[in-house]
């Protein structure tokens, strides 16, 4: 058993049918010695008397808020949560496996640049009685500070007979050095509590591996005289690291017809312009990627050919 926060305790339960459970001793936080009784949640049933209460925690029905009283007065509370292990594996019931980039991916994180700021998000199908707490650091043995805000509900989606809730959190490395080579990964830890169930989730990554630039901005077309060709131009996104001479991007320019089946013409360039043939009813899209490290491509920025 360990303390999650004041008066809230997590019991680690290795569960299987007929498991003996965990013996937990609760102590009433009071100088009083006599006339103390214990109850669970809203029930008036007396579970025991004395300054300590010994309970056998076998299942969620044994968790909840234990209260010690004397003469009708509440002396202290202890909220017991369960962290369940089955077949040697800690439960992961609260968050949904996003399965990308691989199975057992519960937390996904992205950064728009090398400033040390990043966003993580996760999915759940639980709509109520749910709290998250996020901590982060660079490295784990001698951790350097990363400050995370509060997790917030950022999207709700209905997919068939599933209703999904997306939560996200923003974090900022306290002393980020954008140009430095990373040797220690960022660690992100999320505590999730649903009712009386505690779970924790972790992710470890280098900022360079989670980079996803914003789409190029100010995408414009300039027709070339007496030609079906156009000059496409764009700019680096505002959120990308500076100077651009050091934090350089590469770009992919795509001409896509109205039909998805039509052949796509693609051009790759390090410049912020390109000359392409603009077909009728086609659109031109441009996306960006770090020039020197193959992290994610940005989303597309698009304009119609017409």
């Amino acid at each position: 058993i360990w303390e999650l926060k004041k008066d809230v305790y997590v019991v680690e339960l290795d569960w299987y049918p007929d498991a003996p459970g965990e013996m937990v001793v609760l102590t009433c936080d009071t100088p009083e010695e006599d006339g103390i009784t214990w109850t669970l949640d809203q029930s008036s049933e007396v579970l025991g008397s004395g300054k300590t209460l010994t309970i056998q925690v076998k299942e969620f029905g044994d968790a909840g808020q234990y209260t010690c009283h004397k003469g009708g007065e509440v002396l202290s509370h202890s909220l017991l949560l369960l962290h369940k292990k089955e077949d040697g594996i800690w439960s992961t019931d609260i968050l949904k496996d996003q399965k990308e980039p691989k199975n057992k991916t519960f937390l996904r994180c992205e950064a728009k640049n090398y400033s040390g700021r990043f966003t993580c998000w996760w999915l759940t199908t639980i709509s109520t009685d749910l709290t998250f707490s996020v901590k982060s650091s660079r490295g784990s043995s001698d951790p350097q500070g990363v400050t995370c805000g509060a997790a917030t509900l950022s999207a709700e989606r209905v997919r068939g007979d599933n209703k999904e809730y997306e939560y996200s959190v923003e974090c900022q490395e306290d002393s980020a050095c954008p140009a430095a080579e990373e040797s220690l990964p960022i660690e992100v830890m999320v505590d999730a509590v649903h009712k009386l169930k505690y779970e924790n989730y972790t992710s470890s990554f280098f900022i360079r591996d989670i980079i996803k630039p914003d789409p190029p901005k100010n995408l414009q077309l300039k027709p070339l005289k007496n030609s079906r060709q156009v000059e496409v131009s764009w700019e680096y996104p505002d959120t990308w690291s500076t100077p651009h001479s050091y934090f350089s991007l590469t770009f992919c320019v795509q001409v896509q017809g109205k039909s998805k089946r039509e052949k796509k013409d693609r051009v790759f360039t390090d410049k912020t312009s390109a000359t392409v043939i603009c077909r009728k009813n086609a659109s031109i899209s441009v996306r960006a990627q770090d020039r020197y490290y193959s992290s994610s491509w940005s989303e597309w920025a698009s304009v119609p050919c017409s």
């Epitope: 569960w15 049918p17 299942e59 969620f60 029905g61 089955e86 019931d93 199908t125 639980i126 209905v158 007979d161 599933n162 209703k163 649903h194 009712k195 009386l196 169930k197």
Partner: nanobody, 123 residues
């Protein structure tokens, strides 16, 4: 919101078998653990059995262990309670319940409840 509808109750002789079904609908049914409870006249609601949302783990009250089997078919959105070697003391209204705190034998740990189906075991 999960909706639960029980069926399969009836009158049987002691020693016979019966299979109860609980059809579920609504959002996120497959993410819920499912349980069966029962309530005899004048008695409190009593836990019978539960199955985890993955269907890989089951939990039984001592009074039904070895006689009752809980199972689920996520493709059919249905949970079953196979009851054998029935006894007169198994007579009760049987309720299907859905929640997210598996394992729990406590009724208030379940969020959604069916209307119940009557099982009567005569001697």
């Amino acid at each position: 919101e999960v909706q639960l509808v029980e069926s399969g109750g009836g009158v049987v002789q002691a020693g016979e078998s019966l299979r109860l079904s609980c059809a579920a609908s609504g959002y996120n049914f497959k993410d819920h653990d499912l349980g069966w409870f029962r309530q005899a006249p004048g008695m409190e609601r009593e836990f019978v059995a539960a199955i985890s949302w993955r269907g890989s783990s089951t939990y039984y009250a001592d009074s039904v262990k070895g006689r009752f089997t809980i199972s689920r078919d996520n493709a059919k959105n249905t949970v079953y309670l196979q009851m054998s070697s029935l006894k007169p003391e198994d007579t009760a209204v049987y309720y299907c319940a859905a929640g997210r705190l598996y394992p729990s034998s406590r009724s208030r740990d379940y969020d959604y409840w069916g209307q119940g189906t009557q099982v009567t075991v005569s001697s």
